[in-house]
């Protein structure tokens, strides 16, 4: 870890506080050991150099120790997610020490001032950890810093300044403004802990990105591409409010990272898996559902430690609420065309039928365009566990659902008015489950009838385990 930029005094001088707060003799950073799940309980305030509170409050030197670090705030009161996270940690790790890092006086500022305060808060945490290290049995290996938004970068500074290396830092949608593209010593980065895992839920390539877009950890997970989170759209958020603003959407998407992490703690039996991929578009095409060579991982608390030479970007889809887990499928469809299709893009839907349940009708998202006489790959996901897949219904939507499609159809007709009808042939569909890594092949129910046209459907039944590839070995990954 690089050394701190200056002596402690210099760091204290950096504090950006209103005049009224500067005269305070009380510390601007407080460490509250949450000794009980009861929110009414005052907990214990830890004070550097004072061992008595540690003993009085039953600080467990050999147990895991979590430091929860909030971010910038527009309020003098903790946001509600904090209680949920503390409670979830207590539920999952009963013997653990859960410490809330309260830096509200320094975070409840102009954003730029709060950013400038992150370094000194990180330094305060590092000093607390250095002091705890002097105690018998306390190990930095057992320390897990969890930082939300600006708090993620505070965790980075803490990991940077501490003597030694903390076990883990989880960045929950680390803040973007003033950190995007910054030097590694001025933001959360992989060398701040033995394992740095990051969830990105509010990244935008246009306008202001509240969350950082660049990968900053050993693994960087981008649920739903890291941008638009289900259940956070204007309609979802404003539709249920008497008064609503875009702020609610921002809060919903930015804070989703916290709720995904909470979900990983409380719904251990429903873990969500993310898959390594170079970019969001390739993931949306269904290309990246491999678990070979550590290419998939659980998200949140259950993430397995991976220290790659370079950042690993991982993607997954989620539900709109807890439990967030979905089941991912890669679908490979070889499309034959015996007739000139023109420019029209088919709108395909699939329904999956399994031993446990049947899916809803799912759209096949066409990321670029359907390649004719070629194999097209799609990503579909279901909210329920279907069990073993038995059959698939493929539908080509008839009536146009958008002006854009209508225009394309009209243009296609004008260019080929005598085209007797649009028709595609599909003989089989190959499916791979992301969660089980199982591969299956589905063949057209009627081998004599493999053609599909608008308003029509085709049925496919499972015809073999695995894919029609010679000598292919497909190790099934046992995931919990």
């Amino acid at each position: 870890s690089p050394t701190p930029f200056g002596p402690e005094g210099q760091l204290e001088d950096e504090l950006h506080k209103p005049k009224a707060i500067q005269t305070e003799v009380k510390p601007s950073v407080r460490f509250n050991l949450r000794t009980s799940k009861d929110p009414e309980h005052e907990g214990c305030y830890l004070s550097l150099g004072h061992s008595q509170p540690l003993e009085d409050c039953g600080f467990n030197m050999t147990a895991k120790t979590f430091f929860i670090i909030h971010g910038w705030t527009m309020s003098g009161i903790f946001e509600n997610w904090l209680h949920k996270l503390v409670s979830a940690l207590h539920t999952r790790e009963k013997d653990a020490n859960v410490v809330v890092v309260d830096w509200l006086p320094l975070a409840h500022q102009l954003y730029t001032d709060a950013v400038n305060n992150t370094r000194v808060v990180g330094h305060s945490i590092a000093r607390m950890l250095d002091w705890l290290q002097e105690k018998d049995d306390f190990s930095l290996e057992n320390v897990h810093l969890i930082g939300y938004s600006l708090g993620a970068h505070v965790a980075g500074y803490a990991g940077n300044f501490v003597k030694g290396t903390v076990g883990r830092i989880t960045g929950l949608d680390p803040a973007g403004p003033m950190f995007e593209g910054a030097d590694i010593h001025k933001r959360l980065s992989p060398d701040d802990a033995d394992f740095v895992d990051v969830l990105h839920t509010y990244t935008r390539s246009f306008g202001l990105s509240i969350g950082i877009q660049m990968p900053v950890g050993h693994i960087d997970i981008y649920p739903n591409g890291g941008d638009f989170q289900p259940g956070c759209g204007l309609n979802d958020v404003l539709g249920s409010m008497a008064y609503g603003t875009i702020t609610e959407v921002v809060k919903c998407e930015h804070e989703r990272a916290v709720h995904l992490f909470v979900d990983s703690l409380v719904n251990q039996d429903k873990p969500s898996f993310a898959f390594q991929c170079t970019d969001s578009n390739r993931f949306k095409k269904g290309i990246c559902l491999s678990c070979r060579k550590n290419r998939c991982n659980s998200i949140g608390y259950n993430a397995k430690k991976m220290r790659n030479k370079r950042n690993s970007k991982m993607y997954l889809k989620t539900r709109a609420g807890m439990p967030f887990r979905v089941y991912h499928y890669q679908m490979k469809i070889h499309v034959f065309s015996y007739k000139n299709m023109g420019e029209i893009e088919p709108t395909f839907y699939v329904t999956l039928y399994g031993t446990n349940a049947d899916s809803q009708t799912l759209p096949l998202e066409i990321v670029e365009r359907i390649e004719q006489n070629a194999t097209n790959t799609f990503l579909v996901y279901t909210e329920e566990d279907l069990g073993d897949l038995l059959k698939i219904q493929l539908t080509w939507e008839g009536a146009s659902q958008s002006w854009y499609n209508l225009w394309k159809e009209l243009r296609s007709y004008l260019s080929q008015p005598h085209n007797p009808g649009r028709e595609l042939n599909i003989r089989r569909i190959r499916v791979k489950s992301g969660e089980t890594q199982r591969k299956l092949t589905f063949c057209a129910e009627d081998p004599e009838n493999t053609s599909i046209s608008p308003g029509r459907e085709l049925w496919f039944r499972k015809c073999r385990d695995g894919w029609r590839m010679k000598n292919e070995t497909s190790p099934t990954v046992e995931l919990p």
Partner: antibody, heavy 119, light 107 residues
Framework: EVQLQQSGPELLKPGASVKISCKAS????????MHWVKQSHGKSLEWIGG????????TYNEKFKDKATLTVDKSSSTAYMELRSLTSEDSAVYYC????????????WGQGTTLTVSS | DIVLTQSLATLSVTPGDSVSLSCRAS??????LHWYQQKSHESPRLLIK???QSISGIPSRFSGSGSGTDFTLSINSVETEDFGMYFC?????????FGGGTKLEIK
């Protein structure tokens, strides 16, 4: 024993201002947020806002942003709410309530201060 | 703002009966819901916090359940001292809001 003692009833004319007090005892005043709630006659409760006594940080219900100002005096463990430009709509019982550590639920309430605005 | 709806304005019960009071949120509020009892000319009193957590000093006949948007306060064998107004409150997002209340009265 935790206690929140509020100031007495007020009868004021429209346009006036009033400062209601809430003196806390039985706990560390700076460790918990203090909230203010309005209850109009025979009606439900409305959250006005909350203050963090540790450093004076506040959060307001947008509806009361121009009406109420929350402050604290740490030396006397007292929270204050000032209401300005009073109208008959402000006639109500006002409660202070101690938040839990996260500020979410209110286990202790003051006895209420009745404010009557009448010309 | 999150709207909390207590569909029953008044509930008439006989002492000894068991009763359930409902509170519905206009959006998912997880478990961030609290229940209060208020008797005439008194301050509200916290009965249940965070949907189901009991409060010391509150009789065990009061219990809470629910998560997301639908919540219930149950009173097992109502006693005469239980009559009064019951309010729910959410702390999921600002501004914190209260339900319109349900009046529990003697039949």
């Amino acid at each position: 024993e935790v206690q929140l003692q509020q100031s007495g009833p007020e009868l004021l004319k429209p346009g006036a201002s009033v400062k209601i007090s809430c003196k806390a005892s039985g706990y560390t005043f700076t460790d918990y947020t203090m909230h203010w709630v309005k209850q109009s006659h025979g009606k439900s409760l409305e959250w006005i806002g909350g203050i963090n006594p540790y450093y004076g940080g506040t959060t307001y219900n947008e509806k009361f942003k121009d009406k109420a100002t929350l402050t604290v005096d740490k030396s006397s463990s007292t929270a204050y709410m000032e209401l300005r430009s009073l109208t008959s709509e402000d006639s109500a019982v006002y409660y202070c309530a101690k938040g839990d550590y996260y500020g979410g639920s209110y286990n202790y309430w003051g006895q209420g201060t009745t404010l009557t605005v009448s010309s | 703002d999150i709207v909390l709806t207590q569909s029953l304005a008044t509930l008439s019960v006989t002492p000894g009966d068991s009763v359930s009071l409902s509170c519905r949120a206009s959006q998912d509020i997880s478990n961030s819901l609290h229940w209060y009892q208020q008797k005439s000319h008194e301050s509200p009193r916290l009965l249940i916090k965070y949907a189901s957590q009991s409060i010391s000093g509150i009789p065990s006949r009061f219990s809470g359940s629910g998560s997301g948007t639908d919540f219930t306060l149950s009173i097992n064998s109502v006693e005469t001292e239980d009559f009064g107004m019951y309010f729910c409150q959410q702390s999921n997002s600002w501004p914190y809001t209260f339900g319109g209340g349900t009046k529990l009265e003697i039949k």
